[in-house]
């Protein structure tokens, strides 16, 4: 039996090693021998759990032998040298390479010493985010889409927004066997207030140093929302000319502005200039309801404003007058 004190010889290796699909990876494995200890190594062996036989052996006189010679290579072991480094390189990683491997040293006088290493096969996903252009529907619809393609394991997708919203995430197999494509939809009831706002898709994956953030600028198509500004309920005869503005928010942009009154065409004192209406000075009181009708690709909407020009001293008030 081995003499006392020989139990200190240990195999050092990480418990888990990550490798990328299609790339090569080194499974590190070393025999740690304390200063006062003596050991002699005659064979290095790698075996995979659940499989019969060993996948790689380095023999003191026969050298290296491999179950798949094109895919495996002892990194440091050499004939005629001390066998203390059993590190094994694997080329062209496949999904099925993921699993538990045993690295073993055949030593004298200690006997066999081994350690298990979990090989994790990763695939780095490609991430994209895009807006889902929507119209006002009155019910929740996908407004943004985030896709993480070909990840192993599947990427984690989360959404960050001040607008609320709910994610709807699904998975399908990726193009390469063992990979997964994750699609996440961000769902919200569309409104004009949401148009142009940003939401952020956050993609997390083992292969990333830090999460990837993808910003989506939301698009909601809606007909014009119209109001008229420029009137302060304080217009008097004899005051300067004034301007009313037809304020319209819409997506897409307005294609036309049309001014009129409830009685029909504009009176002579009102001159349309696109989104603006010039009100010229008048010499008698008026009480007219003006209409601004705005059109875009989705339809037309209008706003009404009743304007009164009252009698009163022009010097004390703003309003409508001849200069």
């Amino acid at each position: 039996w081995p003499p006392p004190g020989t139990g200190d010889v240990v195999v050092q290796a990480p418990t888990q090693v990550p490798g990328f699909l299609g790339d090569s990876v080194t499974l590190p494995c070393y025999l740690q021998v304390p200063n006062m200890e003596v050991t002699h190594v005659s064979q290095l062996t790698w075996a995979r759990h659940g499989e019969s036989g060993s996948m790689a052996v380095f023999h003191q006189t026969q050298g290296p032998s491999y179950s798949e010679s094109k895919r495996l290579e002892f990194v440091a072991a050499r004939l005629g040298a001390e066998l203390r480094n059993a590190s094994l390189r694997m080329f062209g990683l496949r999904v099925e390479d993921e699993g538990n491997y045993t690295c073993l040293f055949v030593t004298f006088p200690q006997g066999s010493r081994s350690v298990d290493i979990w090989l994790r096969v990763l695939a780095k996903p490609q991430n994209t985010a895009e807006v889902q252009k929507v119209q006002l529907t009155g019910e929740p619809v996908p407004m943004a889409r985030c896709v993480s393609t070909g990840g192993r394991p599947p990427a984690q997708i989360t959404w960050h927004s001040d607008l609320g919203g709910m994610p709807n995430t699904s998975q399908v197999p990726g193009f390469l066997s063992g990979t997964v494509t994750v699609t996440s939809l961000w769902i919200l009831v569309p409104s004009s207030q949401v148009d142009g706002k940003n939401v952020t898709c956050k993609v997390e994956h083992e292969s990333f140093e830090k999460p990837q953030l993808l910003t989506v600028n939301l698009t909601v198509y809606y007909p014009p929302e119209v109001s008229i500004s420029g009137y302060d309920n304080n217009w008097y005869l004899g005051q300067n000319e004034a301007t009313l503005t037809c304020d319209a928010r819409s997506n897409p942009e307005p294609t036309g502005y049309n001014w009129s009154t409830t009685m029909g065409p504009l009176p002579p004192f009102a001159v349309a200039q696109g989104a603006q209406l010039l009100i010229r000075p008048v010499d008698k009181p008026i009480n007219t309801t003006l209409i601004c009708n705005v059109t875009n690709a989705l339809g037309a909407r209008q706003a009404e404003l009743t304007v009164q020009v009252k009698e009163g001293p022009p010097s004390e008030h703003s309003g409508i007058s001849r200069n």
Partner: antibody
């Protein structure tokens, strides 16, 4: 070529000791552990123990309860096995074998007969 | 100690036959198993190491397989010169132990 040449046959009385030599050539003696295996006539193989020539580390099969001593002479690249308190059941062919985890080269064997 | 149980203990086969010898370990020995051929009046000769790897110079009709506790030595096409006794051996832990042997005769 690697060669392990053992000393000749021995006839011993019960209670006596025997020392067998194994002279090596064709490789660096200090780079390989030397082990000893015995085989009673018509029977299986039994591992006795091993020694590494460099620092003289040894490992013994407990079945031999301190009756076996393994030594080396690095100057002549020779390994020795001494077995004491011989009894009739120790009658066997004794082999030295170079260790590579398994045993890749063996001596020709030394017949030790223990008989009164 | 780890017991290595070999079967059969003896067998006869004709030239050209496929011959299989099995060895069962009493506990897991991984792939730390060797196979030896011993012809009458000669020392054992190493055939296979690490359960399945052939020593250089060993004809490729000899192959080994297995891991854990069950191991097999196969001679794919028996030749007259294969008349011998075959032993398995574990080197997973001390004391190293051998199977009791399989005597192979040619019909």
């Amino acid at each position: 070529e690697v060669q392990l040449v053992q000393s000749g046959s021995e006839l011993k009385k019960p209670g006596a000791s025997v020392k067998i030599s194994c002279k090596t050539s064709g490789y660096t003696f200090t780079e390989y552990t030397m082990h000893w295996v015995r085989q009673p006539h018509g029977k299986g193989l039994e591992w006795i123990g091993g020694i590494h020539p460099n620092q003289g580390e040894t490992s013994y099969n407990q079945r031999f309860k301190g009756r076996v001593t393994l030594t080396v002479d690095k100057s002549t690249s020779t390994a020795y096995m001494e077995l004491s308190s011989l009894r009739s059941e120790d009658t066997a062919v004794y082999y030295c074998a170079r260790w590579t985890g398994d045993f890749d080269y063996w001596g020709q064997g030394t017949l030790v007969t223990v008989s009164s | 100690d780890i017991q290595m149980t070999q079967s059969p203990s003896a067998m006869s086969a004709s030239v050209g036959d496929r011959v299989t010898i099995t060895c069962k370990a009493s506990q897991n020995v991984g792939t730390n198993v060797a196979w030896y051929q011993q012809k009458p009046g000669q020392p054992p000769k190493a055939l296979i190491y690490s359960a399945s790897y052939r020593y250089s110079g060993v004809p490729d009709r000899f192959s080994g397989s297995g891991s854990g506790t069950d191991f097999t030595l196969t001679i794919s096409s028996l030749q007259a010169e294969d008349l011998a006794e075959y032993f398995c051996q574990q080197y997973e832990s001390y004391p190293y132990t051998f199977g009791q042997g399989t005597k192979l005769e040619i019909k």
